[in-house]
C-alpha cells in the first residue's frame, strides 16, 4: 500500500504520500485555533506508471496507454486515498471547543 | 477591495423561511469567520451566530432558538443565512460581517450592505 | 450573557468640542491581557464600521480624532474636534464570552 508506514521509509519516485506539516498560525493566519498549533496534513505525489496502485480499470488502461505512448499528455493522477480526522480546539469567547474534522490527514495514495 | 455584497430585500409571510446570500471579493474567503447581525428597525445590533467557511464550523445565539442555518460555498465565496419559522418580530435588515481575524468570536471589520427582510400576512 | 450599557443614549455636541461616550459590562470583559471591547460608528444609512479594536487600537484607515480607553467592565471612547462626519449612532462590543453583544447604542448629533 501507498501509504505512510512505506512511503515516509523508502525513497519512492513514483506516487506516494510525502510529508506536509501545516502551521495553522504561520502557514494559514488561522490564529484562532488553540490545539494542535499544526499538524502532518502530507499529500499525494509522484507519477503513476502501468499497475502502480491503480484505482479502476480506467486508471489501469490509461497507465498502460501512458507506458506504451510516453509522448501522450494523458495520464493516471496520484491522488488521496485514505484519509484521517483531525481533532481541534479553539475558543469561542472564552469557551472551549472541540471539533472533529473529517478528511484532514492524507494516509495513503492511489493512482486514479 | 474587501467587498461583501448581499441579496436584495425580501418579502415573506409569517412561518415561511428566508435565505440572504452574501457574495465576498478582494480577499480569501476561507481564511475568516463570517458572522451575521440583525438590525430590527430603529433598534440596535443582535449578533446571530457565524460561520467557518474552510471547515463549515458553526456558532449560533441561542437567542434564535435553532431557527438559524448558516451555510457556506467556498466555490463561490458566499455566505448564506436562512432564517425559518419567520414572525412579525424578524423584520429586521440583517448583515454579514467578516471577524477581524485573530479569534473565532471577534470584532468584524468588513460589512455587507445589508438586507432588509419583511414579514407580513 | 454580558449586558453592554453605554451611557449617554444621545449626545449633542458642537463642532470642534470633544464627546465622550461610556461603555459599561456586566461583568469583566478581560482576559489573557486584553479587554475583549470594541467600537463602531454606524452613519444614517449605511452599514456599521470598525473604528477601535481590543479597547484602544485604532482601525486602520480610522481618523486619529477616535481614541478608546478602558479595562474590566468601564470603557470610553473619545472623539476629539467633532466634526459633521461624525454624526450617526456608536455602539460597543464585546467578545469575551459566548454570545457577542453590544450595547444598545448612542447617538451623536451636531448642536
Known amino acids: 500500500a501507498l501509504d505512510t508506514n512505506y512511503c515516509f521509509r523508502n525513497l519512492e519516485e513514483n506516487c506516494c504520500v510525502r510529508p506536509l506539516y501545516i502551521d495553522f498560525r504561520q502557514d494559514l493566519g488561522w490564529k484562532w485555533v488553540h490545539e494542535p498549533k499544526g499538524y502532518y496534513a502530507n499529500f499525494c505525489s509522484g507519477p503513476c506508471p502501468y499497475l502502480r496502485s491503480a484505482d479502476t480499470t480506467h486508471s489501469t488502461v490509461l497507465g498502460l496507454y501512458n507506458t506504451l505512448n510516453p509522448e501522450a499528455s494523458a495520464s493516471p493522477c496520484c491522488v488521496p486515498q485514505d484519509l484521517e480526522p483531525l481533532t481541534i480546539l479553539y475558543y469561542v469567547g472564552r469557551t472551549p471547543k472541540v471539533e472533529q474534522l473529517s478528511n484532514m490527514v492524507v494516509k495513503s495514495c492511489k493512482c486514479s | 477591495e474587501v467587498q461583501l455584497v448581499q441579496s436584495g430585500a425580501e418579502v415573506k409571510k409569517p412561518g415561511a423561511s428566508v435565505k440572504v446570500s452574501c457574495k465576498t471579493s478582494?480577499?480569501?474567503?476561507?481564511?475568516?469567520?463570517m458572522n451575521w447581525v440583525r438590525q430590527a428597525p430603529g433598534a440596535g445590533l443582535d449578533w446571530m451566530g457565524q460561520?467557518?467557511?474552510?471547515?463549515?464550523?458553526?456558532n449560533y445565539n441561542e437567542m434564535f432558538e435553532g431557527r438559524v442555518t448558516l451555510t457556506a460555498d467556498t466555490s463561490t465565496s458566499t455566505a448564506y443565512m436562512e432564517l425559518s419559522s419567520l414572525r412579525a418580530g424578524d423584520i429586521a435588515v440583517y448583515y454579514c460581517?467578516?471577524?477581524?481575524?485573530?479569534?473565532?468570536?471577534?470584532?468584524?471589520?468588513?460589512w455587507g450592505q445589508g438586507t432588509l427582510v419583511t414579514v407580513s400576512s | 450573557d454580558i449586558v453592554m450599557t453605554q451611557t449617554p443614549p444621545s449626545l449633542s455636541v458642537s463642532p470642534r468640542e470633544t464627546a465622550s461616550i461610556s461603555c459599561r459590562a456586566s461583568?469583566?470583559?478581560?482576559?489573557?491581557?486584553?479587554?475583549?471591547m470594541h467600537w463602531y460608528l454606524q452613519k444614517p444609512g449605511q452599514s456599521p464600521q470598525l473604528l477601535i479594536y481590543?479597547?484602544?487600537n485604532l482601525e486602520s484607515g480610522v481618523s486619529d480624532r477616535f481614541s478608546g480607553s478602558g479595562s474590566g467592565t468601564d470603557f470610553t471612547l473619545r472623539i476629539s474636534r467633532v466634526e459633521a462626519n461624525d454624526t450617526g449612532v456608536y455602539y460597543c462590543?464585546?467578545?469575551?464570552?459566548?454570545?457577542?453583544?453590544f450595547g444598545q447604542g448612542t447617538k451623536l448629533e451636531l448642536k
Open positions: 460581517a467578516r471577524g477581524y481575524g485573530n479569534y473565532a468570536l471577534d470584532a468584524m471589520d468588513y
Open positions: 478582494g480577499y480569501i474567503f476561507m481564511k475568516y469567520w
Open positions: 460561520i467557518f467557511p474552510a471547515w463549515g464550523m458553526t
Open positions: 461583568e469583566s470583559v478581560d482576559s489573557y491581557g486584553n479587554s475583549f
Open positions: 481590543l479597547a484602544s
Open positions: 462590543q464585546q467578545n469575551n464570552e459566548d454570545p457577542l453583544t
